[in-house]
Amino acid sequence: EQAPGTAPCSRGSSWSADLDKCMDCASCRARPHSDFCLGCAAAPPAPFRLLWP
């Protein structure tokens, strides 16, 4: 069980004090007001692949 500040969340995730847990930044599209989404905005997004040539 990770405590805030003891280890960083993995790339593409951010710490939620509300849930006491690292959360996937991808969920911020559906729930933009989640507390961890501020941390996602400050971090680069996870890599994605273009769906067109």
């Epitope: 004090a17 509300d18 849930l19 847990k21 729930r31 933009p32 507390d35």
Partner: antibody
Framework: QVSLKESGPGILQPSQTLSLTCSFS??????????VSWIRQPSGKGLEWLAH???????RYNPSLKSRLTISKDTSRNQVFLKITSVDTADTATYYC???????????????WGQGTSVTVSS | DIVLTQSPASLAVSLGQRATISCRAS??????????MHWYQQKPGQPPKLLIK???NLESGVPARFSGSGSGTDFILNIHPVEEEDAATYYC?????????FGGGTKLEIK
């Protein structure tokens, strides 16, 4: 619609292990962000959060009781379990399970609760 | 642990008047952009019911006569105008850190 229902032994003796079951419907504990908590309330007193289990099987416990608590789940059967070892008369209370789930504002506090199951520890 | 102290422990309010319940935290339950305070209503023989989440957001189906405010360590639940069905015990709860804790409750009686 969301519903939760607790079940337990009703009465047990000091030093025994209390086993509680929360059976729920209307949501899935495999949904990202979903979780279930156990909370208790001695008669005429306030609420005490005990433990929480997440969709990914991550668990959290109240430090004051952590050594005595074990929370687990059966996602396919829509059930969450709580075990409390070495019970004493101070563990006499109504035990509730409640859901925390994803919401536009973030992650709901405990928005749906069961009706509670009464547990008496007596010799 | 963050201790939540509610006041008063009980109050009696006349029908149609305002009820104000305070919840004070032993340390801040807010960040610069978020306040992790919630309010519940509990009637005898029933489980708690979520009224307000994250300080001021009314849960779906909760009447607009309920409102919440505050930040940091001081939070308020207001009910105005009070109705007969509001007779209950009200609890604050935080989710700023573990363990999640509840206030001791405020019992509201309608005169």
């Amino acid at each position: 619609q969301v519903s939760l229902k607790e079940s337990g032994p009703g009465i047990l003796q000091p030093s025994q292990t209390l086993s509680l079951t929360c059976s729920f419907s209307g949501f899935s504990l495999s949904t990202s962000g979903m979780g279930v908590s156990w909370i208790r309330q001695p008669s005429g007193k306030g609420l005490e959060w005990l433990a929480h289990i997440y969709w990914d099987d991550d668990k959290r416990y109240n430090p004051s009781l952590k050594s005595r608590l074990t929370i687990s789940k059966d996602t396919s059967r829509n059930q969450v379990f709580l075990k409390i070892t070495s019970v004493d008369t101070a563990d006499t209370a109504t035990y509730y399970c409640a859901r925390r789930g994803p919401d536009y504002y973030g992650y709901y506090p405990m928005d749906y609760w069961g009706q509670g199951t009464s547990v008496t520890v007596s010799s | 642990d963050i201790v939540l102290t509610q006041s008063p422990a009980s109050l009696a309010v006349s029908l149609g008047q305002r009820a104000t319940i305070s919840c004070r935290a032993s340390k801040s339950v807010s960040t610069s952009s978020y306040s992790y305070m919630h309010w519940y209503q509990q009637k005898p023989g029933q489980p708690p019911k979520l009224l307000i989440k994250y300080t001021s957001n009314l849960e779906s189906g909760v009447p607009a006569r309920f409102s919440g405010s505050g930040s940091g360590t001081d939070f308020i639940l207001n009910i105005h105008p009070v109705e007969e069905e509001d007779a209950a015990t009200y609890y604050c709860q935080h989710s700023r850190e573990l363990p999640w804790t509840f206030g001791g409750g405020t019992k509201l009686e309608i005169k």
